[in-house]
């Protein structure tokens, strides 16, 4: 399966939208930095087949969608930017789902690496827990926004490696 060029453009647009979403100066939030334990190894793309890498990317985007779809998120971010953000994430989910369907029967390995999916879910659970503990403060959201932008940048690297594997 070829991930379309539009997917890569959508990823870049997602990062641009997230960059615009900031409501307060991040300089006031240094002390709120937190180690979420980003599962770097799941995005190295070396240890599993293409279908499994796609399923990990899909899980990350789905979890991001869930995180920013909460009422607490809606109360924090600009509604217009959020709508654009949802549209881009939805586009990426569709691309990845189409790709996963094409991979059915192509590889002998399972379509999903359950351990990897669980690792990504636990990562997002840590983010949600942090937001809860910080009472969804503006700085907590700024820290989370920075973390998700970093996650998307790193996942974009995995997508590029997948494209080069074609």
């Amino acid at each position: 399966c070829d991930l379309p060029q539009t997917h890569s453009l959508s990823n870049r647009r997602t990062l641009m939208i997230m960059a615009q979403m900031g409501r307060i100066s991040p300089f006031s939030c240094l002390k709120d930095r937190h180690d979420f334990g980003f599962p770097q190894e799941e995005f190295d793309g070396n240890q599993f087949q293409k279908a499994q890498a796609i399923s990990v990317l899909h899980e990350m985007i789905q979890q991001t969608f869930n995180l920013f779809s909460t009422k607490d998120s809606s109360a924090t971010w600009d509604e217009t930017l959020l709508d654009k953000f949802y549209t881009e994430l939805y586009q990426q989910l569709n691309d990845l789902e189409a790709c996963m369907m094409q991979e059915v029967g192509v590889e002998d390995t399972p379509l999903m690496n359950v351990d990897s999916i669980l690792t990504v879910r636990k990562y997002f659970q840590r983010i949600t827990l942090y937001l809860t503990e910080k009472k969804y403060s503006p700085c907590a959201w700024e820290v989370v926004r920075a973390e998700i932008m970093r996650s998307f940048s790193l996942s974009a690297n995995l997508q590029e490696r997948l494209r080069r594997k074609e």
Epitope: L30, F36, E147
Partner: antibody, heavy 121, light 107 residues
């Protein structure tokens, strides 16, 4: 390879203006902040201020607020430090350094080679 | 502003010695503490971040410890290339502040 390359040494007279630069390469320039650090001859390190190149938001040390201006041009991955009227006490080595912003990552992990500014009549 | 105080300001040691430098913050900075090494005419180099994390490429003889207000940089066995000035820096809040430096000289 991540690199921060600073502009060359400058010799200026008191009252003159100056703008020095720091060009980033080998990484996403807008994903990191750029900080500026002063080191006067034979002295320690002093943090001057910082910029987020993604939106040019800045923060200054109270000691340097109003004395210098930090700016950036993300289209050419370059940050700047400027003075409108130099003083002899501005004579120092100036370093730029990369900061991860709000991400849990090493602070000031890459530094420029430094720009020596000499102000003398 | 958060004041950072290093001790000693200088020390003399021999190759193979265990060297300890301390840094005290004027208020709790949890683990937002970095250590840098600077050699004459060179830019500072990050050694330790978040009080105890070893920066990539830095030899394991360097280690950091502490939390709250008191921190330590330890060089387990001093090497010829370790003679330099060492700075601590808090990154809890702006303005970011450095210690005054500790110069490690050859005995």
């Amino acid at each position: 390879e991540v690199q921060l390359v600073q502009s060359g040494a400058e010799v200026k007279k008191p009252g003159e203006s100056l703008k020095i630069s720091c060009k980033g390469s080998g990484y996403s320039f807008t994903s990191y902040w750029i900080g500026w650090v002063r080191q006067m001859p034979g002295k320690g390190l002093e943090w001057m201020g910082i910029i987020d190149p993604s939106d040019s938001d800045t923060a200054y040390s109270p000691s340097f607020q109003g004395q210098v201006t930090i700016s950036a041009d993300k289209s050419i991955s370059t940050a700047y430090l400027q003075w409108s009227s130099l003083k002899a006490s501005d004579t120092a080595m100036y370093y730029c350094a990369r900061h991860p912003g709000l991400n849990w990552a090493p602070d000031f992990d890459y530094w420029g080679q430094g720009t020596l500014v000499t102000v003398s009549s | 502003d958060i004041q950072m105080t290093q001790s000693p300001s200088s020390l003399s040691a021999s190759v193979g010695d265990r060297v300890t430098i301390t840094c005290r913050a004027s208020q709790s900075i949890t683990n937002f503490l970095n250590w840098y090494q600077q050699k004459p005419g060179k830019a500072p180099k990050l050694l330790i971040y978040f009080a105890s994390s070893l920066q990539s490429g830095v030899p394991s003889r360097f280690s950091g410890s502490g939390s709250g207000t008191d921190f330590t940089l330890t060089i387990s066995s001093l090497q010829p290339e370790d003679f330099a000035t060492y700075y601590c820096q808090q990154s809890l809040d702006f303005p970011l502040t450095f210690g005054q430096g500790t110069k490690v000289e050859i005995k």
